[in-house]
Interface confidence: low
C-alpha cells in the first residue's frame, strides 16, 4: 500500500450568482468551505478504486467535486459521467498537491449519478467514484395507474410504477353521472391493489404519493345505457395495456356477450367473462377485452354484442406519441365591466393533460371537464374583470400546448397627465382605445374650446402592461404656449375624460380634472 497516493476528496457548495448561471466552470461564485468526503479504497474492487461519500445536492444548487492528490510528478486524468468522457485539467496548489475539479452548475436530475475520475500518475493508476444524488423529492415520480389481470383469478390488479411506492386505491361508484363525483356518498374507496368486485357502474383506480394523485378509469360500455350521440373513443400509446369492459343486465341468464374488433372475433386469451345475480335476481354479465401491450394494429372499432341487447362500439386509437389537439389561434374578447364571462378551451388529449391559466405572471389552478363527444374543456372565470393577456398552458409528457387570450373591458377612458420642459403628455387606458383632442385655455377661450391643431403626436397602443393596451398623446410646446393652460381629452364610445395641464416649468402640473361624459 506504500505506492498508493494520499487522496482527499472534498465537496464545495456554491451560492448561485443568478446572473452567471450556465457559464463555464470559471464563473464567479461565492463558495462555502470545502467538506471532506472521506475518500477511502473500496473493498473487494478490481483495481484501485477510491470511493467518496454519497453527495446529496439540492436542486439548482451548484457544487464542485474536488480531488487533491499527494503524489510526486505529473498526473493526467479523465472524468467519465454516464458513459461520456469529460475534459479534465489538473493543476497544482501551493502545497504541490494535484487538484482535479468537477463543477456542477445548477444541479438537475440529469446531473445526478456516478462521476468516475480516472487518474494516471507516474507511479500508479487509480479511479475515484463520486455518487451524486438529488436531495429528497426530485427523484420522485408518479405514473398513471394501469390494469393487469390477476393470474388464475377473475380479478384486476392496479399498478402504478411510482417512486416512492404509491398508495393504490380503487374508487367505485354504482350510480350514474354527477353522483359519482369524488366526495359523493355513492363513492366507495378500497385501499388495495386487487379488485374482485368488477360489476360496478364506475370503476377507477388511483395512485397517490408525495407528488399527488393520478387516476385511470376502467373504460366501460354498458349495453343497458342509451348509446352516446358520438362514438366513445379510447386513446392508448403503443405498449400500453388495453382494457375495455362490456356490461349488460338481463332478466335471466339466457344471453351471451361477445367482443369483435373490426367484425372479427377477439382471439382466445384476450377476453374473459364474469357473471353474477343482482339483488333483484337479474343476471349481470361483464366481458373484458384486454391486450397486455398494444400495437398499432390493435386500433379499430371494438364492438360488444349481446343476444338480448343492441350492440355498442368504441373506437380504440393507438398512437405512437401522446397529443393535445386544440386550436391555438389567439382569441380576443371585449366585455362590459360587470358582464359575466369565462375563457374556455376545448381540446382532445392523451394522456390527460396538466394545465395552468396565467395572468400577470400569476398562475391559477386549472380544472378540466370531460364532454360527451370525447373532448374536454377547461374554463377560467376568475379574471376579476382585469383587462390583459391570459395564457392557457397544457402539457402531458409528450406534447405541449399554449393558447393566448386577450380580455378587453369596455369602459370610458381615464386620463393621466404629465408635463416636462418641452412637452405635455397624456395617457389613458379604457376600451375601445380612445382618440385625443387638445384644447387651449385662454382669455378668448376660458372654457378651453380653442383647438390646438399642431404639435400633437398620438401613439396608440404603444405600451403593453400584461397585455393591456395604453394610448398616449403628446403635445410639443412652443415658446408661445408657455404659461398657458391646456386640456387633453380622451374619448371613446363610452365617454370622455379630460385633464388640464399648466404649461410652465418642468415637472408634472396637472390640475383641475374635468370629466365630461
Amino acid at each position: 500500500n506504500q505506492d498508493l497516493p494520499v487522496i482527499k476528496c472534498v465537496l464545495i457548495n456554491h451560492k448561485n450568482n443568478d446572473s452567471s448561471v450556465g457559464k463555464s466552470s470559471s464563473y464567479p461564485m461565492v463558495s462555502e468551505s470545502p467538506e471532506d468526503l472521506g475518500c477511502a479504497l473500496r473493498p473487494q474492487s478490481a483495481g484501485t478504486v477510491y470511493e467518496a461519500a454519497t453527495v446529496e445536492v439540492d436542486v439548482s444548487a451548484s457544487i464542485t467535486l474536488q480531488v487533491l492528490v499527494d503524489t510526486p510528478g505529473n498526473i493526467s486524468c479523465l472524468w467519465v459521467f454516464k458513459h461520456s468522457s469529460l475534459n479534465c485539467q489538473p493543476h497544482f496548489d501551493v502545497q504541490n498537491r494535484g487538484v482535479v475539479s468537477m463543477v456542477i452548475l445548477k444541479m438537475t436530475e440529469t446531473q445526478a449519478g456516478e462521476y468516475l475520475l480516472f487518474i494516471q500518475s507516474e507511479a500508479t493508476n487509480y479511479t475515484i467514484l463520486f455518487t451524486v444524488s438529488i436531495r429528497n423529492t426530485l427523484l420522485f415520480t408518479l405514473r398513471r395507474p394501469y390494469f393487469r389481470k390477476m393470474e388464475n383469478q377473475d380479478a384486476l390488479v392496479c399498478i402504478s410504477e411510482s417512486v416512492p411506492e404509491p398508495i393504490v386505491e380503487w374508487v367505485l361508484c354504482d350510480s350514474q353521472g354527477e353522483s359519482c363525483k369524488e366526495e359523493s356518498p355513492a363513492v366507495v374507496k378500497k385501499e388495495e391493489k386487487v379488485l374482485h368486485e368488477l360489476f360496478g357502474t364506475d370503476i377507477r383506480c388511483c395512485a397517490r404519493n408525495e407528488l399527488g394523485r393520478e387516476c385511470t378509469r376502467l373504460f366501460t360500455i354498458d349495453l343497458n345505457q342509451t348509446p352516446q350521440t358520438t362514438l366513445p373513443q379510447l386513446f392508448l400509446k403503443v405498449g400500453e395495456p388495453l382494457w375495455i369492459r362490456c356490461k349488460a343486465v338481463h332478466v335471466n341468464h339466457g344471453f351471451g356477450l361477445t367482443w369483435e374488433l373490426e367484425n372479427k372475433a377477439l382471439e382466445e386469451g384476450s377476453y374473459f367473462e364474469m357473471s353474477t345475480y343482482s339483488t333483484n335476481r337479474t343476471m349481470i354479465r361483464i366481458l373484458f377485452a384486454f391486450v397486455s401491450s398494444v400495437a398499432r394494429n390493435d386500433t379499430g372499432y371494438y364492438t360488444c354484442s349481446s343476444s338480448k341487447h343492441p350492440s355498442q362500439s368504441a373506437l380504440v386509437t393507438i398512437v405512437e406519441k401522446g397529443f393535445i389537439n386544440a386550436t391555438n389561434s389567439s382569441e380576443d374578447y371585449e366585455i362590459d365591466q360587470y358582464e359575466e364571462f369565462c375563457f374556455s378551451v376545448r381540446f382532445k388529449a392523451y394522456p390527460q393533460i396538466r394545465c395552468t391559466w396565467t395572468f400577470s405572471r400569476k398562475s391559477f389552478p386549472c380544472e378540466q371537464k370531460g364532454l360527451d363527444d370525447g373532448y374536454s374543456v377547461s374554463k377560467f372565470c376568475n379574471h376579476k374583470h382585469q383587462p390583459g393577456e391570459y395564457i392557457f398552458h397544457a402539457e402531458n409528457g409528450d406534447a405541449q400546448f399554449t393558447k393566448m387570450f386577450t380580455l378587453n373591458i369596455r369602459r370610458k377612458p381615464q386620463v393621466l397627465a404629465e408635463a416636462s420642459a418641452s412637452q405635455a403628455s397624456c395617457s389613458s387606458d379604457g376600451y375601445p382605445l380612445p382618440s385625443w383632442t387638445w384644447k387651449k385655455c385662454s382669455d378668448k377661450s376660458p372654457n378651453c374650446t380653442e383647438d390646438i391643431p399642431e404639435g400633437v403626436w398620438n401613439r396608440k397602443a404603444n405600451r403593453k402592461v400584461f397585455g393591456q393596451w395604453v394610448s398616449s398623446s403628446t403635445l410639443n410646446m412652443s415658446e408661445a404656449m408657455k404659461g398657458f393652460l391646456v386640456k387633453c381629452c380622451a374619448y371613446n364610445s363610452l365617454g370622455t375624460s379630460c385633464e388640464t395641464i399648466l404649461l410652465n416649468s418642468p415637472g408634472p402640473f396637472p390640475f383641475i380634472q374635468d370629466s365630461i361624459s
Epitope: 478490481a46 483495481g47 467519465v80 459521467f81 454516464k82 458513459h83 461520456s84 468522457s85 440529469t110 410504477e161
Partner: antibody, heavy 124, light 107 residues
Framework: QVTLKESGPTLVKPTETLTLTCTLS??????????VSWIRQPPGKCLEWLAH???????SYSTSLKNRLTISKDSSKTQVVLTMTNVDPVDTATYYC????????????????WGQGTLVTVSS | DIQMTQSPSSLSASVGDRVTITCRAS??????LGWYQQKPGKAPKRLIY???TLQSGVPSRFSGSGSGTEFTLTISSLQPEDFATYYC?????????FGCGTKVEIK
C-alpha cells in the same frame, strides 16, 4: 417498427475522411435514455465498438480510435453521423449502427436493433 | 480495456446436439453481458441480455448464465437455423468490447 439504416460511401481513398449516417425510424434520440452506437466488422473478423451518442448528447469513443472519430446527431434527432479522419486500408469493414435503450431502474439494453450494415472499402 | 475471450473459436455439431459456448472477461463485469447471433451477410441479432435474460421472440432453447468473469451460452437442442457465429459483448465499462466469436458449423 424500429429500423436503423446506414449510408455513406462504399469506396474511400486512404487519408480521406469517411462520413457515415445512421437514419433512425420508429424511434428518435428525442427520448431520454436512448442512444446509438457505431460498430464495425472487417471482412471475416471480429466486431469492434467505435462510439456512441445518447439523446442528451453524451458521447463515448473507442480508446484506440478516439482521436480520429467524431459522433453527432442532427437537429431532428433522427440521424446520427460518424466521421472518421485519415482512413487506412485496415479501416475496410462493414459499419453498423445499433440502438441502446436506458431503462428507468438504471440498466441499459445494448443493441436490441441493428442496421443492415454498409461495407466501406478503403483503397487507392 | 476489458478483454472478452470466447471459446471455442469454432465447433462442429449435429442437429439436436447440446452446445455450450463460453465467454471469459478479463475482469469482473457483474452481469453486464449480452449474446448475439450473426449469419453470413447479416447484422447481428440479440439473443440474451443481462447475462441470462432471453430476448423476446428468441426460442427458449437458447439460455445464458454466469456472472462476474465466466459466462456461457447454451443451445439445448441445436436446430438447422442455429448454424451461425455467436458473439458476447460486455457493456460494464468503456470501451465496450466483443468476444471474437464462435462459429457453429454442421458436423
Amino acid at each position: 417498427q424500429v429500423t436503423l439504416k446506414e449510408s455513406g460511401p462504399t469506396l474511400v481513398k486512404p487519408t480521406e475522411t469517411l462520413t457515415l449516417t445512421c437514419t433512425l425510424s420508429g424511434f428518435s434520440l428525442n427520448n431520454a435514455r436512448m442512444g446509438v452506437s457505431w460498430i464495425r466488422q472487417p471482412p471475416g473478423k471480429c466486431l469492434e465498438w467505435l462510439a456512441h451518442i445518447f439523446s442528451n448528447d453524451e458521447k463515448s469513443y473507442s480508446t484506440s480510435l478516439k482521436n480520429r472519430l467524431t459522433i453527432s446527431k442532427d437537429s431532428s434527432k433522427t440521424q446520427v453521423v460518424l466521421t472518421m479522419t485519415n482512413v487506412d486500408p485496415v479501416d475496410t469493414a462493414t459499419y453498423y449502427c445499433a440502438r441502446i435503450v436506458g431503462y428507468g431502474s438504471g440498466w441499459y439494453g445494448f443493441f436490441d436493433y441493428w442496421g443492415q450494415g454498409t461495407l466501406v472499402t478503403v483503397s487507392s | 480495456d476489458i478483454q472478452m475471450t470466447q471459446s471455442p473459436s469454432s465447433l462442429s455439431a449435429s442437429v439436436g446436439d447440446r452446445v455450450t459456448i463460453t465467454c471469459r472477461a478479463s475482469q469482473g463485469i457483474r452481469n453486464d453481458l449480452g449474446w448475439y447471433q450473426q449469419k453470413p451477410g447479416k447484422a447481428p441479432k440479440r439473443l440474451i441480455y443481462a447475462a441470462s435474460t432471453l430476448q423476446s421472440g428468441v426460442p427458449s432453447r437458447f439460455s445464458g448464465s454466469g456472472s462476474g468473469t465466466e459466462f456461457t451460452l447454451t443451445i439445448s437442442s441445436l436446430q438447422p437455423e442455429d448454424f451461425a457465429t455467436y458473439y458476447c459483448l460486455q457493456h460494464n465499462s468503456y470501451p465496450l468490447t466483443f468476444g471474437c466469436g464462435t462459429k457453429v458449423e454442421i458436423k
